[in-house]
């Protein structure tokens, strides 16, 4: 089958209320078939490529386990499983300041050197 | 050949800990995540958490977070699940499994035979 | 969590007859769903990876189809070997999960 390409899939938006959870989903598509090398993922908040990072998680060759390097305040987890190609995001314990815009990325090292970012990211309502 | 041989059963009061121990042979212990399942009398599967061996890396089960940790010693090949703070309900077969790996697909291809750790006072 | 709900919870068929089990998940798991059958007293073994591919030495009676939330185990012509607990498991999201579980007899 053809290679796939970069995608991300995002909502436009995430609602809840101040004091509860959100989940932010994120998934992508990549032309690396059958990768299993270095991952990293990241959200960072505000503006794609250049806003501060809210989450950062490493898994190691051939582990599905990913690591988690930064939490904001110990407050964002990963639900999804990166190497299923989903980077879906938990936020607890909601603060009105979390109402702004999310960007996923994900990056490939090792023997495939690759990353992609979302462009327009998910934009979380916190009430 | 591929084999998980774990420690043998346990008898524990509330409110102890257990250790239980899985070692691993016939494989690079370092490179594949363990993880740890557990099935009450009679019931279903329930993951607990997992850990990579090389890395030393662990992500646990919510459920599980506060009274479980799990640990490796690549010298010896054995990956171990600690639970505190043991009740009733934590009467289970407890089982580590290695999460395999094909062509960028990940599964559980080898269990260990299950340890059974009863909670009784 | 991801609640996978499988269906029937237990199941008699004739030797020889096709055994169908159902597992569906609360929300989309993409194709990220194995099976693994369980013998009484014995540890899981894997039958099924990524909804479809059948594990190293699994016999080709069974098979799995699906994705997104529902899932499908078949074993074509059921065997005597087979009488076992079947579950199945989603590895798309933290914490993997199991369904509870369908027991399959002879009927």
């Known amino acids: 089958s053809p290679a796939q390409r970069w995608s991300m899939q995002v909502p436009p938006e995430v609602s809840a209320e101040a004091g509860d959870a959100a989940v932010l989903p994120c998934t992508f598509t990549h032309p690396h078939r059958h990768y299993d090398g270095p991952l990293t993922a990241i959200w960072r908040a505000g503006e794609p490529y250049a806003g501060p990072q809210v989450f950062r998680c490493a898994a190691a060759r051939g582990s599905e386990l990913c690591q988690t390097a930064l939490s904001l305040h110990g407050r964002f987890r990963l639900l999804g499983n990166p190497r299923r190609n989903d980077l879906s995001l938990r936020v607890e314990r909601l603060a009105l300041a979390d109402d702004r815009r999310y960007f996923c990325r994900v990056e490939f090292a090792g023997d495939v050197h690759d990353r992609y970012e979302s462009r327009h990211g998910v934009r979380l309502h916190v009430t | 050949q591929v084999q998980l041989v774990q420690s043998g059963a346990e008898v524990k009061k509330p409110g102890a800990s257990v250790k239980v121990s899985c070692k691993a042979s016939g494989y690079t212990f370092p490179r594949y995540d363990v993880s740890w399942v557990r099935q009450a009398p009679g019931q279903g599967l329930e993951w607990i958490g997992v850990i990579h061996p090389g890395s030393g890396g662990t992500g646990y089960n919510e459920k599980f977070k506060a009274r479980v940790t799990i640990t490796a010693d690549t010298s010896t090949s054995t990956a171990y699940m600690e639970l505190s703070s043991l009740r009733s309900e934590d009467t289970a077969v407890y089982y580590c499994a290695r999460r395999g790996l094909n062509k960028g697909y990940w599964f559980f291809d080898f269990w260990g035979q299950g340890t059974l750790v009863t909670v009784s006072s | 969590d991801i609640v996978m709900t499988q269906s029937p919870d237990s199941l008699a068929v004739s030797l020889g007859e096709r055994a169908t089990i159902n597992c569906k998940a609360s929300?989309?798991?993409?194709?990220?769903v194995d099976w693994y059958q369980q013998k009484p007293g014995q540890s899981p073994k894997l039958l099924i990876y990524?909804?479809?591919n059948r594990y190293t030495g699994v016999p080709d009676r069974f098979s799995g189809s699906g994705s997104g939330t529902d899932f499908t185990l078949t074993i074509s012509s059921l065997q005597a070997e087979d009488v076992a607990v079947y579950y199945c498991?989603?590895?798309?999201?933290?914490?993997?999960?199991f369904g509870q579980g369908t027991k399959v007899e002879i009927k």
């Open positions: 929300q989309n798991v993409g194709s990220n």
């Open positions: 498991m989603q590895s798309n999201f933290f914490p993997f999960t």
């Open positions: 990524e909804s479809t």
